[in-house]
């Protein structure tokens, strides 16, 4: 998940030198931005949060807002602060006229400004008829406390809180911040506005059909009545839970955030600010049958982000819309006919579908899991949610074909027993945005903040690129993908894993002068290759003949086509040890695969040779995945030859310290 | 499979009432806002009225407003137009439509009836 | 009287593509999703197009629409016979609180 893409509009205002009389011009030649929705009827002109740089302390704010108000009345323009942001990011939110935009963002401070939008539920209620709650089934594993010592919070409508799912389990804090419902005749109606929080809540943490029975909920009420509610509402919301953190921390936390609105830079940033301070968010991709990307908080990396299936494992369908999918989601969760507890009565059951509903399941998932293992960090959650995850069952023909290859094919589990986990190396796959067509276009693919990359891979559908590199970028490396001309754009994949007191470098060997090709080695004692990576200047890198083979005895090196740069990703940590597996198909095909066996897994995937007519490498849980052109537009020379090769690692030192647990 | 029937279309004299019905199956009726289209003979679309999927809001065109009521029983998976004080410019065929989505009434109408006429005239 | 203007017909031989445009403004099209509707000969409308771009499971990719400022437009690639039919642009008009659709465009196959 990236978070500064998203079909996002952004209007970008130069600082202008006059600077009206300000105490303190900011820095010459900086430029503020201004950003809003980009769907059209979610847009709330009028309110506008503004953002102030990172470090800007609260007086700062509080001046800054002072002084918009001041250059404002000397226009003659009325403007009112309705709130001041501090503890998650610093800023306030301004109710004014969009005319004063361009002066706002001349203003001291300022990193840029939005303006604020609608958000919205995103479940809808199902079968009318009471229902008789399940239960778990007894062979799913239940941890004797059920989520005990994790705190969810729920960022949603009202709640019923004396609903017998849910009573005593739920505090409804004194959080408000909601918009007034549409419409004329619209009528508050208890059970209507408790709806959709009551069913989460009862999803989560409910008697009966709850995930996490032991878990105890705090609810905000950030939806109004018809589910609606606006991104500063959210924004002050996630405000509210960190000051509370902060005032009195407890365990962990979990964050549901069942709601989604267009893309918004101010709340994935508010998000990734929460999840840095050790809260885990997991929040609905969206019912728009579209891209998560194009919507927040789903498009927020560091937010663990939930799409809906059926109990068939299909992709949930509502209507002509469904549940959202691409590189965003992080995995699937049931979402279809979920039933849960109803507001219309204290005892009554509903079923409701949609992706908030499957962000409630992972949500009970990820509380059982951090009750069972309260020290685990957002990443190492991350991790183990995906890797417990259901493999290859959703029907992958229900998504837009260009969004196949992008969208996770895992269903959230609870996982066996929270034991034995430990040894396991734990690695996901993670797609940049796509660069765009331009001939220097490149995308970029990173791991979070306490991932490792362990190697990097490129793809095109056009099968015009240039390879990828790994490359430091902020004391983090990165996965950059580069387009060729003529290419209608490129994928970065990094495998992102979880290696503790890793130390990993890149090992670079230039374009090699000798027809028998390029290659680089991992020559640091102790040091092993955990991915190859091919990088070349040319636009069509030509048949490489003779193939390029590796030597025996040396599974320490990456070999690649004697016109490119090869790369390769060194890392010694602890007890780690590698192997190369390779899997040559001699006739052209469409895709080679080669998978890591059991006990190993899988932290690089590259092709050989590294020839045009190949569209690129990627991993695919513990299978390494090689695709090349249409057959039919290759022919079957030895051209056609592909070779998937895979970087298989375990980590003894894991095995040993989880061993030592037990 | 999702269908839409419209009934209780018919001729009628102008200033009388009429009131159309819209059964609905193959979907969860309560959960998507429904819309009223009708299409006068020879001519384009003319959009009608709207109710959300709770029946909390409602929307109608100027020409029929405080002639027309629409309504919809959940318990039933029925949609239902009250023209009262009709005119002969009302004559048309009536489709009813579903909404595409739930809370965004402004993204238009995924599933259409076959349509009932109406004829107003003396 | 229609606030969504769109021409009264367009024409093309088999194969070639037409272009329909929508005309509105900032209280309707500006800022409200588009969707297009085709309505072949004594039949119902059909949706073609919602969110101004995204075509509905079942509708081919010779169909899309796209949106700019208080103007949409549907193309037609690869035009075929059966595609002879009336074709509505329609979207939600914040200033009416209504529904509007377009005076509607017939395409012709030559």
């Known amino acids: 998940q990236e978070d500064e893409d998203g079909d996002y509009e952004e209007l970008v205002l130069a600082l202008r030198s006059e600077e009206d009389g300000l105490a303190e011009a900011p820095e010459h030649g900086t430029t503020a931005t201004f950003h809003r929705c980009a769907k059209d009827p979610w847009r709330l002109p009028g309110t506008y949060v503004v953002v102030l740089k990172e470090e800007t302390h609260l007086s700062q704010s509080e001046r800054t807002a002072r002084r918009l108000q001041a250059q404002a009345a000397r226009r003659g323009y009325l403007t009112k602060i309705l709130h001041v942001f501090h503890g998650l990011l610093p800023g306030f939110l301004v109710k004014m006229s969009g005319d004063l935009l361009e002066l706002a963002l001349k203003l001291p401070h300022v990193d840029y400004i939005e303006e604020d939008s609608s958000v919205f539920a995103q479940s809808i209620p199902w079968n009318l008829e009471r229902i008789t709650p399940p239960r778990y089934r007894a062979d799913e594993y239940q941890p004797p406390d059920g989520g005990s010592l994790v705190e969810v919070y729920l960022l949603d409508t009202s709640i019923q809180s004396d609903h017998r799912e849910i009573e005593g389990r739920v505090m409804v804090t004194d959080f408000e911040n909601v918009p007034e419902e549409d419409g004329t005749r619209f009528h508050r109606q208890a059970s209507k506005c408790d709806s959709h929080g009551t069913h989460l809540a009862g999803v989560v943490s409910g008697r009966d059909a709850g995930v996490a029975k032991g878990a105890s909920m705090r609810s905000l009420r950030v939806l109004n009545c018809q589910g609606k509610g606006t991104v500063s509402g959210t924004l002050i919301g996630l405000e509210f839970i960190r000051k509370s953190q902060l005032v009195q921390p407890v365990g962990p936390l979990v964050v549901l955030l069942p709601l989604a609105g267009g893309y918004s830079r101010v709340l994935n940033a508010a998000c990734q600010r929460l999840a840095r301070a050790g809260v885990v968010l997991v929040t609905a991709a969206g019912n728009f049958r579209d891209d998560a990307c194009l919507y927040s908080p789903a498009s927020a990396p560091e937010v663990i982000t939930v799409g809906a299936t059926n109990a068939q494992d299909q992709p949930v369908t509502l209507g002509t819309l469904g549940t959202n999918f691409g590189r965003c989601v992080d995995l699937f969760a049931p979402g279809e006919d979920i039933i849960g507890a109803s507001s219309d009565c204290s005892t009554c059951f509903v079923s409701q579908s949609g992706t908030s509903q499957a962000a409630a399941h992972v949500a009970g998932i990820a509380a059982m899991m951090l009750s069972a293992e309260p020290e685990l960090t957002l990443a190492e959650l991350r991790q183990r949610l995906i890797h417990f995850s259901a493999k290859d069952v959703i029907n992958e023909a229900w998504f837009p074909e260009d969004q196949r290859v992008l969208t996770p094919n895992l269903v959230a589990a609870l996982p066996p027993s929270t034991h034995g986990a430990g040894w396991q190396l734990f690695c996901r796959t993670v797609w940049s945005a796509h660069s765009g067509p331009t001939r220097m276009a490149t995308a970029v693919a990173r791991c979070a903040p306490d991932e490792e990359l362990l190697s990097c891979s490129s793809f095109s559908r056009s099968g015009k690129r240039r390879g990828e590199r790994m490359e430091a970028q902020g004391g983090k490396l990165v996965c950059r993908a580069h387009n060729a001309f003529g290419g209608e754009g490129v994928y970065a994949i990094a495998r992102c894993c979880l290696l503790p007191q890793a130390n990993c470098s890149v090992h670079t060997a230039p374009p090699a002068e000798a027809s028998m090709g390029t290659r680089v080695h991992c020559h640091q004692q102790g040091h092993v290759l955990t991915g190859c990576s091919s990088h070349w200047e040319v636009e069509d890198l030509g048949t490489h003949k003779p193939p390029v083979l590796r030597p025996r005895g040396q599974p320490n090196q990456c070999v690649g086509h004697r016109e490119a740069s090869i790369h390769a990703s060194c890392c010694h940590a602890p007890g780690l040890e590698c192997k190369v597996k390779e899997h040559g198909i001699p006739a052209p095909q469409e895709q080679v695969t080669v998978a890591c066996e059991e006990g190993w897994t899988l932290t690089g995937c590259s092709a050989l040779p590294g020839t045009s007519h190949v569209l690129g490498a990627y991993a695919v849980d513990n299978t390494c995945v090689v695709r090349s052109r249409d057959v039919s537009t290759t022919g079957s020379t030895s051209e056609g030859a592909v070779t998937a090769v895979a970087i298989c690692c375990r980590s003894r030192h894991l095995a040993q310290a989880s061993q030592e647990l037990q | 499979q999702v269908q839409l029937v419209e009934s209780g279309g018919g001729v009628v004299q102008p200033g009388r009432s009429l009131r159309l019905s819209c059964a609905a199956s193959?979907?969860?009726?309560?959960?998507?806002?429904m819309h009223w289209v009708r299409q006068a003979p020879g001519k384009g679309l003319e959009w009608v009225a709207l109710i959300w999927h709770d029946g909390s809001n409602t929307y109608y065109v100027d020409s029929v407003k405080g002639r027309f009521t629409i309504s919809r029983d959940n318990s039933k998976n029925t949609l239902y137009l009250q023209m009262n004080s009709l005119r002969a410019e009302d004559t048309a065929v009536y489709y009813c439509?579903?909404?595409?989505?739930?809370?965004?009434?402004?993204?238009?109408?995924?599933?259409w009836g076959q349509g009932t006429t109406v004829t107003v005239s003396s | 009287q229609s606030v969504l203007t769109q021409p009264p017909s367009v024409s093309a031989a088999p194969g070639q593509k037409v272009t329909i445009s929508c005309s509105g403004s900032?209280?309707?099209?500006?800022?409200?999703?588009v969707s297009w509707y085709q309505q072949l000969p004594g039949t119902a409308p059909k949706l073609l197009i919602y969110d101004s771009n995204k075509r509905p499971s079942g509708i081919p990719d010779r169909f899309s629409g796209s949106k700019s400022g208080t103007s949409a437009t549907l193309d037609i690639t690869g035009l075929q016979t059966g595609d002879e039919a009336d074709y509505y642009c329609?979207?939600?008009?914040?200033?009416?609180?209504?529904?509007?659709f377009g005076t509607g465009t017939k395409v012709t196959v030559l």
């Open positions: 439509a579903r909404g595409i989505a739930v809370a965004y009434y402004y993204y238009g109408m995924d599933v």
């Open positions: 193959g979907f969860t009726f309560r959960s998507y806002g």
């Open positions: 900032s209280s309707n099209i500006g800022n409200n999703f």
């Open positions: 329609g979207t939600w008009d914040s200033s009416l609180s209504a529904y509007v």
